[in-house]
Amino acid sequence: LRPSRVHNSEENTMRALTLKDILNGTFSYKTFFPNWISGQEYLHQSADNNIVLYNIETGQSYTILSNRTMKSVNASNYGLSPDRQFVYLESDYSKLWRYSYTATYYIYDLSNGEFVRGNELPRPIQYLCWSPVGSKLAYVYQNNIYLKQRPGDPPFQITFNGRENKIFNGIPDWVYEEEMLATKYALWWSPNGKFLAYAEFNDTDIPVIAYSYYGDEQYPRTINIPYPKAGAKNPVVRIFIIDTTYPAYVGPQEVPVPAMIASSDYYFSWLTWVTDERVCLQWLKRVQNVSVLSICDFREDWQTWDCPKTQEHIEESRTGWAGGFFVSTPVFSYDAISYYKIFSDKDGYKHIHYIKDTVENAIQITSGKWEAINIFRVTQDSLFYSSNEFEEYPGRRNIYRISIGSYPPSKKCVTCHLRKERCQYYTASFSDYAKYYALVCYGPGIPISTLHDGRTDQEIKILEENKELENALKNIQLPKEEIKKLEVDEITLWYKMILPPQFDRSKKYPLLIQVYGGPCSQSVRSVFAVNWISYLASKEGMVIALVDGRGTAFQGDKLLYAVYRKLGVYEVEDQITAVRKFIEMGFIDEKRIAIWGWSYGGYVSSLALASGTGLFKCGIAVAPVSSWEYYASVYTERFMGLPTKDDNLEHYKNSTVMARAEYFRNVDYLLIHGTADDNVHFQNSAQIAKALVNAQVDFQAMWYSDQNHGLSGLSTNHLYTHMTHFLKQCFSLSD
């Protein structure tokens, strides 16, 4: 037995993190995002579950909905109508995929304090929303869209062809939800609620993924999802717009697809209303290096939508795919025709451009060897955006304001010096006309949310400072974190290293690489987290490293597009290169190095283990992709092209985990997957296991019955406990 060294009395009262701390969420933090309802008011659910309206200007708060009313229907969410006469209450939440869920909705009349009776909403509803003005309701039920002029009115049925797993109206199918829209909805009200635009997805010809859901019955259920894998038939999308004032008059009108897009397979990527009679649609070729932004106008005489070729703006990438993870969306200015948009400049960095007539004549608003990440708001005189410019750390996010009313436009960093040590990674949420905004700081210190004046940027009040968390952490020995970079062959590899609390450079530590590494991802971020790897450093004395290699985002197109058409090569190489550099630092025990990852990270960790370098003793892959032929078309083809002979089939075949089965012989491999994974199908791990068995390679595996890609609930506890045992065994750490 070794007595623990006592440095001082204070340190003696400190304790290391435990796995239980992590699994119980003991050190989780809170953020505060105001639910803005005007320029100076927001709604917030109080600790005792009342819905409270705050007026910033007067400092007053009003309970608009009591917890009693919420509880009467077991409501877990709410939505105030813009005329403030009604609230929808959402209950019976039932998750479907990443964003989608069904629920039961009740409408509560605030003027008389009663639930609206008569013409109640059907159940369960797939999506429901208020019009942006007044209290019209649009909702999706059984894949069809319905409209109510007032909550108590009978519904008007807009679509009739909706059919489960075949035709989706106003909601996306699986692949559009996960890989294109990143929403549960596919309908959009015009700014004053005159028109309702919606997408129709026809999945009739899409091949279906089928998997067993074991449940508790004698026979398992089969889950069927139309899911286009790489190269398969894709959904057919159409966009319609209906006049909600007189919905029966002419009915839904289809918006034409630009000719250059319609000539081959294509996607719809987003819709942005500009005014009540002008709409902007974005389309993308199936080979995702050409995107077209089309501005369409309502023709009163014909009651149709006209999209002139002169209002088509083409965005094309010659070095990779169009955009970052998604093609960026435009933010229109007050003239209702010009807009601001983020895309690559001539030097290959994503920056804000102002487009007035043509993309060729775009005026570049930001520039430099860094990237603009998000445009939050454009007002008459200011543009608010986030970037990673400050002090040249790509893993930071600061909020900037550019004055667009003056020439030359002046730029001010709103957040750079607010709480410099504590806060280096921000997002923001703006009220109408950017009269006020909330800043949410995610770290590297304890997260804090603050309210600010939109004109002066003055802090008005702290919305959430996580005091309880701060107090709880006072007697915890947290690991040390550092973010640094490696320069290797003209490539900059940023890394985050998490070091044990009493880290001593003269000692040797086991190293765990945590990898994601997917295209346009970023793992090395200046954010606060107390998670599993924090525990591994704090209690188990491991060094953990995260490395952003080629293919990762926000450092320019050269790094981002390096992996184009070659997934599974450079991401792996860069993890290996980084490990070699870490060994050179002198404090890594090179006989105890492991790698783990989830999803894309599981793919990279598997390939790294099978790289034949002898660097890794063991590793874990959770829900890995094993062949790009098994993954979704929209995602996969964006980066890999098509799995056809005349396109990129060869690399599809070369980049599988199965092709490297033999190389797993000299590593300890733990393969984990949920059997009900709708995203990265269990098929991926089943094929790895089959290849390893056929190669007579020993490995460990764990499946989670009826669990999806997130392995949530009790599975999470089991998963992290199991992985901890595996790593401690691998690193010869006593249990």
Epitope: Q60, S61, Y62, T63, Q85
Partner: antibody
Framework: QVQLKESGPGLVAPSQSLSITCTVS????????INWIRQPPGKGLEWLGL???????NYNSAFMSRLSISKDNSKSQVFLKMNSLQTDDTAIYYC?????????????WGQGTSVTVSS | DIVMTQSHKFMSTSVGDRVSITCKAS??????VAWYQQKPGQSPKLLIY???YRYTGVPDRFTGSGSGTDFTFTISSVQAEDLAVYYC?????????FGGGTKLEIK
């Protein structure tokens, strides 16, 4: 149901002060603002001031020096006190509810109490 | 203070007619304008708030529109019971101010 009822003296001598009580029912004063508005005979409406949910007040600058509004949440009562009344302060005085659900417009009015300033 | 001007003190109309009352603000009040109806011997009643939102229980013949400085209140088909004085009011900032009122008379 929502009700506001003003009770006042009816007659006030010039240079004296006016006190009116507004008793509300059907809602809580912690959740709504109460405005005071007056209407001289045959004339239009004039906003005097308000008391917010939290107890803060805001007065029309024309009455700032002689007006005070207070309340007792537990008794559901709001009080208006105005000093140094003159004959042109003769009016119907209304207490009126306001709040964010109608964008701080005035959704419920009391029946008003008639105040005559005369010697 | 923001001055609200109702240009017509009186308006004469017939049952079934469409009538519009205008109100002008001395400065931009966004959409923070309300319209009230006051019948003889009664307290005012809220009809329209935030320029265009009809208050609960108000018949749909009453509508409001406008933003910035110019606002309109319309009765699409005047009924005999609509005989009243109509006031506009800005609820944009304190002090809240009212227009002078427009008396609607039935011919």
């Amino acid at each position: 149901q929502v009700q506001l009822k003003e009770s006042g003296p009816g007659l006030v001598a010039p240079s004296q002060s006016l006190s009116i009580t507004c008793t509300v029912s059907g809602f809580s004063l912690t959740n709504y603002d109460i405005n005071w508005i007056r209407q001289p005979p045959g004339k239009g409406l004039e906003w005097l001031g308000l008391i917010w949910t939290g107890g803060g007040t805001n007065y029309n600058s024309a009455f700032m020096s002689r007006l005070s509004i207070s309340k007792d949440n537990s008794k559901s009562q709001v009080f208006l006190k105005m000093n140094s009344l003159q004959t042109d302060d003769t009016a119907i005085y209304y207490c009126v509810r306001g709040g964010p659900l109608v964008w701080y417009a005035l959704d419920y009015w009391g029946q008003g109490t008639s105040v005559t300033v005369s010697s | 203070d923001i001055v609200m001007t109702q240009s017509h003190k009186f308006m004469s109309t017939s049952v079934g007619d469409r009538v519009s009352i205008t109100c002008k603000a001395s400065q931009d009040v966004s959409t923070a304008v309300a319209w009230y109806q006051q019948k003889p011997g009664q307290s005012p009643k809220l009809l329209i708030y935030s320029a265009s939102y009809r208050y609960t229980g108000v018949p749909d013949r009453f509508t409001g529109s406008g933003s910035g400085t110019d606002f309109t209140f319309t009765i699409s088909s005047v009924q005999a019971e609509d005989l009243a004085v109509y006031y506009c009011q800005q609820h944009y900032s304190n002090p809240r101010t009212f227009g002078g009122g427009t008396k609607l008379e039935i011919k």
